[in-house]
């Protein structure tokens, strides 16, 4: 089921999916002066069963100017840039993603896609959040948020992280030592 | 209590365009995106796009993608769906419905109907 | 794009019988939703997340289902249940309805 919202803005944070759960969609955008192909796919689609995951579908950029010629490569891990995770991020380097079952890797970039990826979540998804860069993270709890359905209803619940004015930066989990397990995390369910 | 009002009835020519507004009140007007879906006369349902009044980000049913532009005004916690290059076919009643999940509340719809 | 079949198009019955449509769905999806609308009137929340009764809707209604076979029941139809049934997913885009089931008197 969709997340029909966005995850929680925290001040001076940013914040990322490790992986992204079965049912997750990416959108297919190209960078300025290219476009989706005429027949290509407007998502990229996270599926499969317990045991293995993959994106289908496979995003294809061509340029505006040319009718006939497509691009679509699948790089190796050193060409990989910088992107963003949803249309409100700052770019973050990908991190090392342990395979979790039933969820997909972030998909490798391909040939002109547009700065910013926009992935529609579902329920159940969880990002992390981290500080940017010249601010420091004060933890109440878990940097984290989780996509849940109350009444028909998706919310994402607030992450336990402030950024203060400091020269030094927090990372995500697997770039540091572990922080409070989730199983801290006060739930403040909304009412009906 | 929520409330999404919708305008009024339009009659367009063909090759013109049309704008809907639903004016919500009783929640906070950015904290949900606000959906569009469409009934052709006598036909069933069909979802059109959303808004995120919050940034204007918006995401369309690719039938739709070069019929209809939706936008949102977060003063007046309106958000609106113009409607270009009108076609007989695009004679129908249009609604809003108010997104985060299921579709809990909806406007009384806009009947906009298109002959020459 | 997922596709929900809905069946039957038309059902004939009378006030007191137990009435079931089904909405099959192209792809097996999360949940289903189910809305009632009558004659010139806006869609209205019936069933969410496949059994889910909304606020105000009588115990009459009960949902059920999983993966692409879902079913809409009314164990006892009253005279305000005359209406057009619509099945709906929201586990992808484009979001989908069924054609709908209108529920006429017999």
């Known amino acids: 089921e969709l997340c029909d919202d966005d995850p929680p803005e925290i001040p001076h944070a940013t914040f990322k999916a490790m992986a992204y759960k079965e049912g997750t969609m990416l959108n297919c955008e190209c960078k300025r002066g290219f476009r989706r192909i005429k027949s290509g796919s407007l998502y990229m689609l996270c599926t499969g069963n317990s045991s293995h995951s993959s994106w289908d579908n496979q995003c294809q950029c061509t340029s505006s100017a040319t009718r006939n010629t497509t691009k679509q490569v699948t790089p190796q891990p050193e060409e990989q840039k910088e992107r963003k995770t949803t249309e409100m991020q700052s770019p973050m380097q990908p991190v090392d993603q342990a395979s979790l079952p039933g969820h997909c890797r972030e998909p490798p970039p391909w040939e002109n896609e547009a700065t910013e990826r926009i992935y529609h979540f579902v329920v159940g998804q969880m990002v992390y959040y981290q500080c940017v860069q010249g601010y420091r993270a004060l933890h109440r709890g878990p940097a984290e948020s989780v996509c849940k359905m109350t009444h028909g209803k998706t919310r994402w619940t607030q992450p336990q992280l402030i950024c203060t004015g400091e020269m030094e930066t927090s990372q995500f989990p697997g770039e540091e030592k572990p922080q409070a397990s989730p199983e801290g995390r006060p739930e403040s369910e909304t009412s009906c | 209590q929520v409330q999404l009002v919708q305008s009024g009835a339009e009659v367009k020519k063909p090759g013109s365009s049309v704008k809907v507004s639903c004016k919500a009140s009783?929640?906070?007007?950015?904290?949900?995106?606000m959906h569009w879906v469409r009934q052709a006369p006598g036909q069933g349902l069909e979802w059109m796009g959303y808004?995120?009044?919050?940034?204007?980000?918006?995401e369309y049913n690719q039938k739709f993608k070069d019929k209809a532009t939706i936008t949102a005004d977060e003063s007046t916690n309106t958000a609106y769906m113009e409607l270009s290059s009108l076609r007989s076919e695009d004679t129908a009643v249009y609604y809003c419905?108010?997104?985060?999940?299921?579709?809990?509340?909806w406007g009384q719809g806009t009947l906009v109907t298109v002959s020459s | 794009d997922i596709q929900m079949t809905q069946s039957p198009s038309t059902l004939s019955a009378s006030v007191g019988d137990r009435v079931t449509i089904t909405c099959s769905a192209s792809?097996?999806?999360?949940?289903m939703h189910w809305y009632q609308q009558k004659p010139g009137k806006a869609p209205k929340l019936l069933i969410y997340?496949?059994?889910d009764l909304a606020s105000g809707v009588p115990a009459r209604f009960s949902g059920s289902g999983s993966g692409t076979e879902f079913t809409l029941t009314i164990s006892s139809l009253q005279p305000d249940d005359f209406a057009t049934y619509y099945c709906?997913?929201?586990?992808?885009?484009?979001?989908?309805f069924g054609q709908g089931t209108k529920v006429e008197v017999k």
């Open positions: 808004i995120k009044p919050s940034r204007g980000y918006t």
């Open positions: 997340t496949t059994s």
């Open positions: 009783g929640y906070t007007f950015t904290s949900y995106r």
């Open positions: 792809s097996k999806i999360s949940y």
């Open positions: 709906h997913q929201r586990s992808t885009y484009p979001l989908t």
């Open positions: 419905a108010r997104g985060g999940g299921v579709f809990d509340y």
